[in-house]
């Protein structure tokens, strides 16, 4: 039950996560003009990792595409790059979760194939989350780099009189999301590689005993290495039959050994 | 096409309140627009006074900001102004005027005279 | 706030003749997020509001003729009418829109010479 509920935790946990990736990916507010000294401004601009706006006060808005792709920095190029590999892996870690959950039944798929199909979604997850994570914190290293480098030069004098004032730019909403949505996927993949290792039908203990009993005589599998995987000890003891064969409601999805702490 | 009416007293006394009432028709007073007043003193330029926008927020001008204050009514799609403690020098040709793209007033009312006088 | 001063206070042309009021800021209306200038300039004739000519410095407002032109960026910009026309007679002002609060130029007036 235990593995069940840890299993379909990390899927939920994770699709929150990409779907959370994916929002802060399209989102235009990576970066937002920075309102150190005017809370109230005419024009407010904010960029994202495919367009910029401006936000007029009067309501209007307009947003214009990076049009060029050799004309972008290499910084932004990666930061797409990380976050689109991200996306992908997760979509892809979605997918073969689906098929991996416990609860869902997919002709006699094996325990041995979910429980490696839970470990390679897991281990995607955790990619999917540290690349999202690693791609909002170039982008956020990038904008305190650009925000220091304006900030010595924030007025630059023309002619005396006249000044420019440069537009600083500050973390945007996208940052935070993706920061979070990277983190619940990265959890969500150690919680899928967890819920493996209580999937593994741990066949050389199975073997060692079983094959050894006689025809009529049962024998049990101890509980130690299941204990030693950190799922507690075994309180639900299956008789395991000559040959190994299974029993028949180990061969339905009802509740298994491997349901209970 | 938007457009505003101007309605108010002509008259009023120095130290008193002005209040103006703006009409809007031709468009919602709650779509993605600011709404302005302007003012025209007799013969002079044109002084921006402050603005409610589509959200509700006002900004105002700092040289008036202790005396003015915008306000709308959605339900009669009508915006307003109030000006305390008017003097002579508040005697002007009062506009509402629409801004959009470019913060730029898009469309202006006829523009209503207050003369401040006792 | 941002001081906008135009020159000249006024200006006598001739009828199909060109037309140039320039306008000045105290400080840039140049929006580096989308490479826009926050300048507008509107005409106003006796006895009406004023009516909006040119936004963003150079876009003109649709209805206008395109005799008149706007050009400029950061601090110094010009209205051209290339051709004056006898409507064209009026008080012409220049606005920035990029920092609160809103300016006006002191305006400048056409006439016919």
């Known amino acids: 039950m235990a593995v069940t509920a840890c299993q379909g935790l990390g899927f939920v946990v994770s699709l929150i996560g990409i779907a959370g990736i994916i929002a802060a990916t399209c989102m235009d507010q990576w970066s937002t003009q920075d309102l150190y000294n005017n809370p109230v401004t005419a024009v407010f601009n904010y960029q994202g990792l495919w367009r910029s706006c401006v936000r007029e006060s009067s309501g209007f808005t307009e947003c214009r595409g990076y049009f060029t792709l050799l004309g972008l920095p290499a910084m932004l190029q990666a930061v797409r790059a990380l976050m689109i590999v991200g996306i992908v892996l997760g979509a892809i870690g979605l997918l073969v979760s689906i098929f991996a959950l416990k609860c869902i039944r997919i002709g006699s798929m094996e325990d041995s194939a979910k429980a490696n199909m839970t470990l390679t979604s897991g281990i995607m997850f955790i990619v999917s989350g540290l690349c999202a994570i690693a791609g909002v914190s170039v982008f956020a290293n990038m904008l305190v780099t650009n925000f220091w480098m304006s900030t010595a030069n924030m007025y630059t004098g023309m002619g005396g009189m006249v000044q420019t004032v440069q537009t600083r730019y500050t973390f945007g909403a996208a940052l935070f999301v993706g920061w979070v949505a990277g983190g619940l996927t990265l959890i969500g993949g150690v919680m899928m590689c967890i819920a493996c290792r209580g999937l593994a039908p741990e066949e050389t203990n199975y073997k060692a005993v079983s094959y050894h009993a006689s025809g009529h005589s049962v024998a049990y599998k101890p509980g130690g290495f299941k204990a030693s995987t950190g799922f507690g000890s075994n309180t639900k003891n299956k008789k395991i039959y000559d040959g190994g064969a299974r029993t028949e409601d180990e061969v339905q999805s009802y509740p298994s050994k491997h349901d209970y702490v | 096409q938007v457009q505003l009416q101007e309605s108010g007293p002509g008259l009023v006394k120095p130290s008193e309140t002005l209040s103006l009432t703006c009409t809007v028709s031709?468009?919602?007073?709650?779509?993605?627009?600011?709404w302005n007043w302007i003012r025209q003193p007799p013969g002079k330029g044109l002084e921006w006074m402050g603005y409610?926008?589509?959200?509700?927020?006002?900004n105002y001008n700092p040289s008036l900001k202790s005396r003015i204050t915008i306000s709308r009514d959605t339900s009669k799609n009508q915006f307003s102004l109030k000006l305390s403690s008017v003097t002579a020098a508040d005697t002007a040709v009062y506009y509402c005027a629409t801004s959009y793209y470019g913060n730029s007033f898009i469309y202006w009312g006829q523009g209503t005279l207050v003369t401040v006088s006792s | 706030d941002i001081v906008m001063t135009q020159s000249p206070d006024s200006l006598a042309v001739s009828l199909g003749e060109r037309a140039t009021i320039n306008c000045k800021s105290s400080?840039?209306?140049?929006?580096?997020?989308?490479?826009?200038?926050?300048l507008a300039w509107y005409q106003q004739k006796p006895g009406q509001p004023p009516k909006l000519l040119i936004y963003w410095a150079s876009t003109r407002e649709s209805g206008v003729p395109d005799r008149f032109s706007g050009s400029g960026s950061g601090t110094d910009f010009t209205l051209t009418i290339s051709s004056l026309q006898a409507e064209d007679v009026a008080v012409y002002y220049c606005q920035q829109a990029y920092s609160f609060p809103w300016t006006f130029g002191q305006g400048t007036k056409v006439e016919i010479k």
């Open positions: 031709g468009g919602s007073i709650s779509s993605n627009y600011a």
């Open positions: 409610i926008n589509y959200s509700g927020n006002t």
């Open positions: 400080q840039s209306l140049l929006n580096s997020g989308n490479q826009k200038n926050y």
